[in-house]
Amino acid sequence: MAVTACQGLGFVVSLIGIAGIIAATCMDQWSTQDLYNNPVTAVFNYQGLWRSCVRESSGFTECRGYFTLLGLPAMLQAVRALMIVGIVLGAIGLLVSIFALKCIRIGSMEDSAKANMTLTSGIMFIVSGLCAIAGVSVFANMLVTNFWMSTANMYTGMGGMVQTVQTRYTFGAALFVGWVAGGLTLIGGVMMCIACRGLAPEETNYKAVSYHASGHSVAYKPGGFKASTGFGSNTKNKKIYDGGARTEDEVQSYPSKHDYV
């Protein structure tokens, strides 16, 4: 029973995690304009992996897709790749794990096959989660580097009367969604791997016993006797002033209210 619960819980946790990774990848708020210690603007900028958006205080939002592929920073491309790999592995893992679930009967599938599938999906979830966490972390590191660079620029070259306010970007909601989702997928994968141990039939090796009969001796070699243990006992059960359908094309949304404090 514990194995089924662990496997089922692992599947559900991974499912939530992968849904989160997909959501994070699609979200526009990977980086958002830093409002702290800045003059209050009536325009709010935020950027995703696929497009950048500008929300005017009046309520209009305009988004523009990154139509270039070669012109994008290598780091952004790497983050995109990591997130997509994470989604693909996660999706395959989900597909495999559905058939591996102990509570689902598919033909005369043996427990050994289910165990192998559970382990495979578990590993896939772990790698998927790691890809998401890596992708989000790379992007976050990029933001931190750029933030301090633009902060340094803000306090240089301001001798003249006219000042230029540098737009600084900080962590957006998608980063936190990505980290949590990646962590959940990772945990789900670990749970699947633990469940696999309980599903796998154990091999019991009997030591060779020599019989000295009159005439010639016969040695019985250890055979491949398999004991089906059923539910393993070795498994463990472990949460300003105050600032739409989208296409890759430029989009303007219906007005909505935004505050800036």
């Epitope: 304009q33 003059p39 209050v40 603007t41 009536a42 325009v43 900028n45 950027q47 950048s52 958006c53 500008v54 005017e56 205080s57 009046s58 309520g59 209009f60 305009e62 523009r64 006219v162 000042q163 230029t164 306010v165 737009t167 300003i240 002033y241 303007q252 219906y254 007005p255 909505s256 209210k257 505050d259 800036y260």
Partner: antibody, heavy 118, light 113 residues
Amino acid sequence: QVQLQQSGTELVKPGASVKISCKASGYAFNSYWMNWLKQRPGKGLEWIGQIYPGDGDTNYNGGFRGKATLTADKSSRTAYMHLNSLTSEDSAVYFCARWGTGNTMDYWGQGTSVTVSS
Amino acid sequence: DIVMTQSPSSLTVTAREKVIMNCKSSQSLFNSGNQKNYLSWYQQKPGQPPKLLIYWASTRKSGVPDRFTGSGSGTGFTLTISSVQAEDLAVYYCQNNYFYPLTFGAGTKLELN
């Protein structure tokens, strides 16, 4: 079409208060910020503040905080500006204007003249 | 607060003449997110409310004659009237739409010779 109809001319005594109205029609009143502006005779325009009728949220120009109070009534699609402790400095034409694309005042009321005189 | 400086304060012109008026802001009104300048131009005729002509520094509001052209970026902006008509005689204001509080220039008065 979008229309903003403001209340008529006001003649008030110093120290008194006045409430100017701006009735909107022809658009989704709750979904656009309404701005209020002041124009003294022969002078430029000053932004007083803005209100979002959808939830009553407001932003004020620091120079008018305490002087002006902005409110809105969703049911009658009307925005109001209450001016208190009036002095001769408050004698001006007051405009309401809808906030549109590009953070611009795209439609304006005809203006309400307020004269403070004893 | 952002200071908007307009020049000249008044202009005396003749019909069909080309007119250029300037507006300078104390801080850049350029937003890198959408590559747009948050400056608008308004026209105000005597006894009337201001009327929006140009937004995003160079985008004409629908219904505005094409003789009105806005240009500039960052801190320096211009409004050009290619061929002045009698009905264009008014006061023209530039406005900062980027920073709170929203501020206006003192205006450029266009008069007929």
